[in-house]
């Protein structure tokens, strides 16, 4: 039997400290280097072991980030989205997606476009 | 998971050329960076190159600056190590490695742990 797969979308704001190897994520997307079908967002591709981010916990891979201290994330070059991060300074407040699988339904199948593809 | 497979090893005397591909799996080739390490025996892994995503921007050992050429193919999945002016110095298993997107902090292209994925490697001997 198919089953539906349904998702949960949660946006939160996540503030980070830049630690001594900076960040500690990678990201892929962009309008240049899509990831995810019809959509140039920029997601979380990996947490770094020991990184600021890992430290904290919130962020995770395959979120989405929407923004960086405020400035919209939307229709940038992947090395413009790159560098925004790197010049982001010591404080860096992300305004992040998480989209949670919560559940099975009877049929359907998972869109083109999923980036947990 | 990514799989990666080198190819084009072999023994070569001193003075010649081979090239090196690293074929990898996933859809989303485009959004990997990678680079090519080799290890030589009873010695550390060293960093032989480095590409970025979109193949506009490469990093070189010192070692090999001007003798050697990575280059990749996104619409093939493949990452190539062109070798030329070999030396039995360059002797080592030579392997593909890769990283999953773009680190937002400046990117420490010789470092093992900023790598996600390796393959197995592929053996170059050079001779005198």
């Known amino acids: 039997m198919n089953g539906r797969v349904d998702y949960l979308v949660t946006e939160e704001e996540i503030n980070l400290t830049r630690g001594p190897s900076g960040l500690g994520f990678n990201i892929v997307g962009g309008t240049d280097q899509q990831y995810v079908s019809n959509d140039s967002g920029i997601y979380v591709s990996r947490i770094k072991e020991n990184g600021a981010a890992a430290l904290d916990g919130r962020l995770q891979e395959g979120d989405k980030i929407l923004s960086v201290n405020g400035q919209d994330l939307k229709n940038l070059l992947h090395q413009d989205a790159v560098d925004l991060f790197r010049n982001a300074g010591y404080a860096v407040s992300l305004r992040v997606q998480h989209r949670l699988q919560v559940q099975n339904g009877p049929i359907g199948h998972r869109g083109e476009g999923d980036p947990s593809g | 998971d990514v799989q990666l497979v080198e190819s084009g090893g072999g023994l070569v005397q001193a003075g010649g050329s081979l090239r090196l591909s690293c074929v990898a799996s996933?859809?989303?080739?485009?959004?990997?960076?990678m680079g090519w390490f080799r290890q030589a025996p009873g010695k550390e892994r060293e960093f032989v190159a480095h590409?970025?995503?979109?193949?506009?921007?490469?990093y070189y050992a010192d070692s090999v600056k001007g003798r050697f050429t990575i280059s990749r193919d996104n619409a093939k999945n493949t990452m190539y190590l062109q070798m030329n002016s070999l030396k039995p110095e360059d002797t080592a298993v030579y392997y593909c490695?890769?990283?999953?997107?773009?680190?937002?902090?400046?990117?420490?292209?010789?470092?093992?742990?900023?790598?996600?994925?390796w393959g197995q490697g592929t053996q170059v001997t050079v001779s005198e």
């Open positions: 490695a890769v990283a999953i997107g773009s680190p937002v902090d400046s990117y420490r292209h010789s470092d093992p742990l900023e790598y996600d994925y």
């Open positions: 996933g859809r989303t080739f485009s959004t990997y960076t």
């Open positions: 590409i970025g995503w979109s193949g506009s921007s490469t």
